[in-house]
């Protein structure tokens, strides 16, 4: 009685169950009543990451330096190459097929989270008591200078873009 379903890591062909090829190998020929499935290793720069019956291996991803990409992890016969972006850039998608320059936080905004190879800079508005007077991908909002601790008084109030200006206290005559 020919099988209608096969075990895990097998497939049904010509009324018989054949073993799938292991990760890193491709199918050359189905099994027969005399021999097992014929599988061969993927070539250099190729991979298959699952038990399979593929007749061709997949090409490793190319990390194109013209797109700002570099290799984060070299591919094997069982895994694809993982790309990431050059310093100062981040991936435009989860697949990391191209890179864009990290965003800078404008004056009045500070860096909440520094960008990584896969995520952009996260900016936040400087709250009261803090300021940022530069456009930067690294600078956080800085606290206003405390005039009091320097025995000075505020001569000009700070904003989210400027620090306070301190000056000497008026002397009592």
């Amino acid at each position: 009685e020919p099988p209608t379903a096969c075990r895990e890591k097998q497939y049904l062909i010509n009324s018989q169950c054949c073993s799938l090829c292991q990760p890193g190998q491709k199918l050359v020929s189905d099994c027969t009543e005399f021999t097992e499935t014929e599988c061969l290793p993927c070539g250099e720069s190729e991979f298959l990451d699952t038990w399979n019956r593929e007749t061709h291996c997949h090409q490793h991803k190319y990390c194109d330096p013209n797109l700002g990409l570099r290799v984060q992890q070299k591919g094997t016969s069982e895994t694809d190459t993982i790309c990431t972006c050059e310093e100062g850039w981040h991936c435009t998608s989860e697949a990391c097929e191209s890179c864009v320059l990290h965003r800078s936080c404008s004056p009045g905004f500070g860096v909440k989270q520094i960008a990584t190879g896969v995520s952009d800079t996260i900016c936040e508005p400087c709250p009261v008591g803090f300021f940022s007077n530069v456009s930067s991908a690294f600078e956080k909002c800085h606290p206003w200078t405390s005039c009091e601790t320097k025995d000075l008084v505020v001569q000009q109030a700070g904003t989210n873009k400027t620090d306070v200006v301190c000056g000497p206290q008026d002397r009592l005559r």
Epitope: L27, V28, S29, D30, L40, G43, E44, T55
Partner: antibody, heavy 115, light 111 residues
Framework: QVQLVQSGAQVKKPGSSVKVSCKAS????????ISWVRQAPGQGLEWMGM????????SYAQKFQGRVTMTRDTSTSTVYMELSSLRPEDTAVYYC????????WGQGTLVTVSS | QSALTQPPSASGSPGQSVTISCTGT?????????VSWYQQHPGNAPKLIIY???KRPIGIPDRFSASKSGNTASLTVSGLQADDEADYYC??????????FGGGTKLTVLG
């Protein structure tokens, strides 16, 4: 059970081409590669190349690169091996076989190259 | 791709054992566990008797056994019979969708 039946013997002149066919029956044609092997009189086996019928992709031994072409016709479950610029030393029995493992063989086709 | 190296001939008496070697390189026999052995009687197509270094197709008697060490594969025929007299060829996958054969060994059964 896969069976491979090859075309008949041929006599060719030097400089000409020969095309040998290999018709497969039994099994699923697109699910196994076909290798071509030749054997000159009194000599050993020589692997010429292979074709993957599912996509038609080929791989040829370096020695035959540029002179051999392997094709397939899925409608008739037939693969072909064409060898061009024949010379007398190409006189041999040409076999098709299933896969790289070559677990099933055709009966062989004698190609004689003679002026 | 150079041919794998086999002794041109081997012999033994009925009932004895004979071993045939097949020496390649670290790019073929040594690199992959995809060595096959074939038996060819005169006037016939070759017949697969061993694949994947040591596996026998169903129907091939266990008198035929094989192994591999480093860059050399070996076929042993034990309990020699008159019908074992034939040519024996090894082959190995050599990477990049290439295959290479040995030069062949003529096995003679004496007596």
């Amino acid at each position: 059970q896969v069976q491979l039946v090859q075309s008949g013997a041929q006599v060719k002149k030097p400089g000409s081409s020969v095309k040998v066919s290999c018709k497969a029956s039994g099994g699923t044609f697109s699910s196994y590669a076909i290798s071509w092997v030749r054997q000159a009189p009194g000599q050993g086996l020589e692997w010429m190349g292979m074709i993957n019928p599912s996509g038609g992709t080929t791989s040829y031994a370096q020695k035959f690169q540029g002179r051999v072409t392997m094709t397939r016709d899925t409608s008739t479950s037939t693969v072909y091996m064409e060898l061009s610029s024949l010379r007398p030393e190409d006189t041999a029995v040409y076999y098709c076989a299933r896969g790289f493992r070559m677990d099933q063989w055709g009966q062989g086709t004698l190609v004689t190259v003679s002026s | 791709q150079s041919a794998l190296t086999q002794p041109p001939s081997a012999s033994g008496s009925p009932g004895q054992s004979v071993t045939i070697s097949c020496t390649g390189t670290s790019s073929d026999v040594g690199a992959y566990n995809f060595v096959s052995w074939y038996q060819q009687h005169p006037g016939n197509a070759p017949k697969l008797i061993i694949y994947d270094v040591r596996k026998r197709p169903i129907g091939i008697p266990d008198r035929f056994s094989a192994s591999k060490s480093g860059n050399t594969a070996s076929l042993t025929v034990s309990g020699l019979q008159a019908d074992d007299e034939a040519d024996y060829y090894c082959s190995s996958y050599a990477g990049n969708n290439n295959l290479v054969f040995g030069g062949g060994t003529k096995l003679t059964v004496l007596g």
